[in-house]
């Protein structure tokens, strides 16, 4: 049965050319963490492996940094990295746990955090 | 205390092969993968490829494919090297050594087994 | 393969002297970088992480410095257990890859 869940920096905006630090947190759960992957609606952005470290996708490679943690950095924003992004936990023996961010890149300079939230 | 313990030189002949035994002790040998290092002439260092005990997955340098074969025994706690179609260029020492979940670095390191390739 | 550069391949110090090895990256590798210590006919052992994160154990004359492609490793105050080489590694993305070594040697 799975038990985790993950918590998320949930709904989040951020100002055009800055950056932004996506994180998720598995809790809940004594499974293994073998890989996190990150997407962008069905665009991998990166894999972090528990053995092979982290690969980011070449054509992100330019405005994503790995870190903090198993998190993931996006610098210099647009407006067009507004939309979903998903934290997929690939874990042991439980399976996949999914987290959803969403981001709003704000022209203006009024860029709010959202609250957190979690997903089972 | 920690401990990776390898076995003994070898001196093998040109078109052998040789496995190498790395065996732990003092901590959970599934917790951690072993990775194989290649030293030639006491000068840099190669990574070779890593094993994860746990799930048996392993990955290569490109280089070392073909020429290594990575095992594990979890009953033993020991992980195993084989080297195939030896040649002097494979004369070295070999070195295996641990990492940590999403920690990509060496935190303890084997004794260490010369090779010796030589007719 | 990110390509680890090291310098200097060599240099001679005398106890009590503060030395400087430094490590060039290929490409960015942001703060994924270790430092071993070889002693002759040792095995390496772990002196820093994460470019500057010291484990357990490791004396604190040791520090790390750096992120992206230029990182150094600086001993003050030299001790005689200290002359031996050094090595830097990334640990960013396999296949992970090794400087070519500082041996630093007693002046």
């Known amino acids: 049965m799975m038990t985790g869940t993950i918590e998320t920096t949930g709904n989040i905006s951020a100002e055009k050319g800055g950056s932004i630090i996506l994180q998720c947190h598995l809790s809940s759960t004594t499974a293994q963490v073998t890989q996190v992957n990150w997407e962008q609606q069905d665009q991998l952005l990166a894999i972090c492996n528990a053995d092979l470290g982290w690969h980011i996708s070449p054509s992100f490679k330019d405005r994503v940094a790995p870190g903090p943690g198993l998190g993931l950095t996006l610098q210099s924003l647009t407006v067009n990295d507004t939309g979903e992004y998903f934290c997929i936990y690939h874990t042991y023996p439980d399976g996949t746990y999914t987290g959803r961010i969403f981001l709003e890149v704000l022209e203006s300079s009024v860029a709010e955090h959202g609250a957190r939230f979690q997903i089972p | 205390e920690f401990q990776l313990q390898q076995s003994g030189p070898e001196l093998v002949k040109p078109g052998a092969s040789v496995k190498i035994s790395c065996r732990a002790s003092?901590?959970?040998?599934?917790?951690?993968?072993i990775n194989w290092v290649q030293q030639t002439n006491g000068k840099s260092l190669e990574w070779i490829g890593v094993?994860?005990?746990?799930?048996?997955?392993?990955n290569y340098n490109q280089k070392f494919k073909g020429k290594a074969t990575l095992t594990v025994d979890q009953s033993s706690s020991a992980a195993y090297m084989q080297l195939n179609s030896l040649t002097s260029e494979d004369s070295a020492v070999y070195f295996c050594?641990?990492?940590?979940?999403?920690?990509?670095?060496?935190?303890?390191w084997g004794t260490g087994t010369t090779v010796t390739v030589s007719s | 393969d990110i390509q680890m550069t090291q310098s200097p391949a060599s240099l001679s110090a005398s106890v009590g002297e503060t030395v400087t090895i430094t490590c060039r990256a290929g490409?960015?590798?942001?703060?994924?970088l270790a430092w071993y210590q070889q002693k002759q006919g040792k095995s390496p052992q772990l002196l820093v992480y994460?470019?500057?994160t010291l484990p357990e154990g490791v004396p604190s004359r040791f520090s790390g410095s750096g992120s992206g492609t230029q990182f150094s490793l600086k001993i003050n105050s030299l001790q005689s257990e200290d002359f031996g080489s050094y090595y830097c590694q990334h640990h960013y993305g396999v296949p992970w890859t090794f400087g070519g070594g500082t041996k630093l040697e007693i002046k």
């Open positions: 490409e960015n590798i942001y703060s994924y």
């Open positions: 050594a641990r990492n940590g979940n999403f920690a990509w670095y060496f935190d303890v």
């Open positions: 094993i994860n005990p746990k799930f048996g997955t392993i």
């Open positions: 994460n470019a500057k």
């Open positions: 003092g901590y959970s040998f599934t917790a951690y993968s």
